[in-house]
């Protein structure tokens, strides 16, 4: 089974240019317990919430978002009203959080294409997930300044060093407008949209015992580096932008129970330990 | 296991306000929202709408717009209902809950009459 | 606003047997794109806030007996509690989970025969 990926697109509506609709999906063998939806940056880390959709409970949504919906039973769309006539969202970072099983919280964010026309975004394009373990971020110029040839030639050079571990960069609270080339079983080494995604984080999913009441014993040892999905050893992320976020572990707290997400299985939606209870708030 | 507690029985006279606190414990305050239904005597369920107090982005059904006020205070883990001039059909019990109406408070019992 | 009517408004049914409440909404509960229906049924016994039973029409919420079972699609629904148990006296209510503003139906009063 290939590593999940998610996708992030925001496009203007033609008709209303005060429109802006967010599309977000999740490429991955689970099944999707809950999707957050996100403006200004990532859940939990800056960004305030927009919608939350739950497969069966239903959605939730808050202004400006105006209807939040399932699309297929792997992505969701968002539309949003925007009434201010200065448009701060063509300017503005979404996110969209997929908690899955057993794959873990994925989250990805991207932004309106700085010159978009109305309603000829490109069609949604699947976007790597950036790996802890897997993942490396070249030098911001280069990526400006050498062609596809010499992408390629990185590419096959990365395989032969030791893949360095990524770290939370907060230079740029924006989005990479990556146009990034990163092969993966999902993916084998396509060009993805640059406006398509950005920043993502991965934590892990847990399975343990539910209680009756619907919520599971957890674990009170440390947080762990749990093993992920069998991925190549190398998968470089060649990116222009510093907005890296990189959450691995499963932290816990005493009283924390996120609520379960079917008969016997417990999803850790959140590895963040305090917030990991966004379980099961809807949206309509 | 997440629980709501709510405040105790008020009665109080037409034309006055009420202010119904829920608190919440055994979850992230900020990471859920919080729900307000009433239910008169011997009647249904209504919706009034909910708080997501980490935003504090709020949801109001119509029918109570403008008569009704949802706070929250993060630092105590407590959500406010607040509903101003009221009515004896307004006497009611009100509930908290939470994660589409999984958890829900004890209820309070809110008597208008002159 | 999106109607909820159940229907019998009560019902009366002996100790082992079978109880069906019905549920109908003005509009689909059906989102097409992912084909679930969002429909959840409680029950509120004297003196208590509702219980969360059944949800996207047919999931038992954790805990919730077996006997309880919820089936349906688009605007039609239906909750069987397949042998009734003398802790199953309660009114039961369904209610849309599609849209704002969720809306309950008004109840149906189940008592022992």
């Known amino acids: 089974a290939g590593t999940p990926e998610v996708w992030v697109q925001v496009q203007m509506e033609a008709t209303e240019l005060s429109s802006f609709t967010v599309h977000c999906g999740f490429l991955g063998p689970g099944s999707i317990s809950l999707v957050t939806v996100s403006w200004g940056g990532p859940d939990g880390a800056g960004g305030t919430k927009l919608a939350v959709l739950h497969p069966e409970l239903g959605t939730r949504q808050w202004a400006p978002a105006r209807q939040a919906r399932w699309e297929t039973q792997s992505s969701i769309s968002l539309a949003l009203e925007d009434s201010g006539a200065s448009s701060p969202f063509a300017n503005t970072t979404f996110c969209c959080k997929f908690a899955s099983f057993p794959e873990g919280s994925w989250e990805s964010c991207g932004s309106l294409p700085p010159s978009s026309d109305p309603g000829l975004s490109a069609p949604p394009t699947p976007v790597p997930i950036l790996r802890a373990d897997l993942a490396g971020i070249l030098g911001l110029s280069g990526v400006l300044l050498f062609g596809c040839g010499y992408l390629l030639h990185l590419l096959r050079r990365q395989k032969h060093r030791p893949t360095p571990r990524l770290q939370p960069s907060h230079t740029n609270s924006q989005a990479l407008t990556a146009q990034a080339w990163a092969p993966s079983q999902a993916s084998q080494a396509a060009l993805h949209d640059p406006y398509a995604t950005i920043n993502t984080s991965f934590c892990p999913a847990t399975l343990d015992t539910a209680h009756p009441n619907g919520w599971a014993s957890l674990p009170t040892h440390a947080a762990h580096q749990p093993q992920g999905p069998a991925a190549s050893a190398s998968t470089p992320i060649l990116a222009r932008g510093s907005f890296v976020s990189v959450e691995n572990g499963l932290y816990t707290q005493a009283g924390e129970r996120p609520p379960h997400t079917g008969p016997g299985l417990t999803l850790f939606p959140d590895c963040r330990g305090p917030r990991a209870l966004e379980g099961r708030f809807g949206v309509r | 296991e997440v629980q709501l507690v709510q405040s105790g029985a008020e009665v109080k006279k037409p034309g006055s306000s009420v202010k119904v606190s829920c608190k919440a414990s055994?979850?992230?305050?900020?990471?859920?929202?919080i729900e307000w239904v009433r239910q008169a005597p011997g009647q249904g369920l209504e919706w009034m709408g909910e708080?997501?107090?980490?935003?504090?982005?709020?949801n109001y059904n119509e029918k109570f717009k403008g008569r009704v006020t949802f706070t929250a205070d993060e630092s105590t883990s407590t959500a406010y209902m607040e509903l101003s001039s009221l009515r004896s059909e307004d006497t009611a019990v009100y509930y908290c809950?939470?994660?589409?109406?999984?958890?829900w408070g004890q209820g309070t019992l809110v008597t208008v009459s002159s | 606003d999106i109607v909820m009517t159940q229907s019998p408004d009560s019902l009366a049914v002996s100790l082992g047997e079978r109880a069906t409440i019905n549920c109908k909404s003005s509009?689909?509960?059906?989102?097409?794109?992912?084909?679930?229906?969002?429909l959840a049924w409680y029950q509120q016994k004297p003196g208590q806030p509702p219980k969360l039973l059944i949800y996207?029409?047919?999931t038992r919420e954790s805990g919730v007996p077996d006997r309880f079972s919820g089936s349906g699609s688009g605007t039609d629904f239906t909750l069987t509690i397949s042998s009734l148990q003398a802790e199953d006296v309660a009114v039961y209510y369904c209610?849309?989970?599609?849209?704002?503003?969720?809306?309950f139906g008004q109840g149906t009063k189940l008592e022992i025969k």
């Open positions: 996207g029409a047919s």
């Open positions: 809950s939470s994660y589409w109406f999984a958890y």
């Open positions: 209610q849309n989970a599609h849209s704002y503003p969720p809306t």
């Open positions: 055994g979850g992230t305050f900020s990471s859920f929202s």
């Open positions: 509009q689909s509960l059906l989102n097409s794109g992912n084909q679930k229906n969002y």
């Open positions: 708080i997501l107090p980490g935003s504090n982005s709020t």
